[in-house]
């Protein structure tokens, strides 16, 4: 049957967990993807962000993942609205960005 | 105050069981990650295993010589680590530390353990 | 399994500056952790993340990293740092921790 929200959200949280822990060299050979408003946008922007960056294996099970939670397809550039004053940041800090506002979404109890 | 304090530690026989406890207390204890590292006598410091918080899925590493005897567990409702130990032998003779990174990895980064209890010490002989 | 490794023993005089090295493979992609154990006592988290110093630790003691080494200097050491000294990083996986054998540092008072 279908993963209950909250189950895929921890095994979310894990994956991004595992993609941080004690990690210094660059995430993605220091790529750099759009800021986005997480509290706006949720997990499409998020995907929308990731979209543009390729050939990194560290991320491709995070970029599955969050595909599971965006209803529809998302191409690339799709929510440009919704990023933060065009600004750029590296993916190792959009990740540690995303993993703290899922922390607190499941904290908050909205996936339960 | 920040503080960790373990217990349970104590003379076995060889083929027995121990487990050892952690109370925590001064930080948020669901958030950390927990570690436990022992000292042989007269020996350095050797990493025994972690669990990470419950929000970070909760699971636990083992160092090769202690897996599958080990368990590290916890019960955040009492801010308390466990160290369950099985199958003793001479070599686990040591004093058992818990350790803590007690903020960093809430946040995605992992500080090094930055506060640790006195030690408990055990002693495995026939 | 993976090792850290750290030389058994420095001695300087007082004022003179420490340097404890310690080599591992996942170096160059995990951070190493230094910590300070004094006869008898529970360790002390001295470096973080490479060369980060944690309120409350001198500034004498800094760290620093390069390929598979990492260092722990302390610049004018003094008798009340002499001490065992540790490295601790993960593997490459990040799951498994690991410290070094251990640096007695002497001050030569």
């Known amino acids: 049957g279908p993963v209950p929200p909250s189950t895929a959200l921890r095994e979310l949280i894990e994956e991004l967990v595992n993609i941080t822990q004690n990690q210094k060299a660059p995430l993605c050979n220091g790529s750099m993807v759009w800021s986005i408003n997480l509290t706006a946008g949720g997990f499409c922007v998020a995907l929308d962000s990731l979209t543009n960056v390729s050939g990194c294996s560290a991320i491709e099970k995070t970029q599955r993942m969050l595909s599971g939670f965006c209803p529809h397809k998302v191409s690339a550039g799709q929510f440009s609205s919704l990023h933060v004053r065009d600004t750029k940041i590296e993916v190792a800090q959009f990740v540690k960005d995303l993993l703290l506002h899922l922390k607190k979404l499941f904290r908050e109890g909205q996936f339960n | 105050e920040v503080q960790l304090v373990e217990s349970g530690g104590g003379l076995v026989k060889p083929g027995g069981s121990l487990r050892l406890s952690c109370a925590a207390s001064g930080f948020t204890f669901s958030n950390a990650w927990m570690s436990w590292v022992r000292q042989a006598p007269g020996k350095g410091l050797e990493w025994v295993g972690r669990?990470?918080?419950?929000?970070?899925?909760?699971?636990?590493n083992y160092a090769a010589p202690v897996k599958g005897r080990f368990t590290i567990s916890r019960d955040d409702s009492k801010n308390t680590l466990y160290l369950q130990m099985n199958s003793l032998k001479t070599e686990d003779t040591a004093v058992y530390y818990c350790?803590?990174?007690?903020?960093?990895?809430?946040?995605?980064?992992?500080?090094?353990?930055?506060?640790w209890g006195q030690g408990t010490t055990v002693t495995v002989s026939s | 399994s993976y090792e850290l490794t750290q030389p058994p023993s420095v001695s300087v005089s007082p004022g003179q500056t420490a340097r404890i090295t310690c080599s591992g493979d996942?170096?160059?992609?995990?951070?190493a952790y230094w910590y300070q154990q004094k006869s008898g006592q529970a360790p002390v988290l001295v470096i973080y993340e490479d060369s980060k110093r944690p309120s409350g630790i001198p500034e004498r003691f800094s760290g620093s990293s390069s390929g598979t080494m990492a260092t722990l200097t302390i610049s004018g050491a003094q008798v009340e740092d002499e001490a065992d000294y540790y490295c601790?990083?993960?593997?490459?996986?990040?799951?498994?921790?690991?410290f070094g054998g251990g640096t007695k540092l002497t001050v030569l008072g």
């Open positions: 996942a170096l160059p992609e995990k951070y």
């Open positions: 669990i990470r918080s419950e929000i970070d899925g909760g699971t636990t």
């Open positions: 350790a803590t990174d007690q903020v960093g990895a809430y946040y995605g980064d992992y500080y090094g353990m930055d506060v």
């Open positions: 601790h990083s993960t593997d490459s996986s990040g799951n498994h921790g690991v």
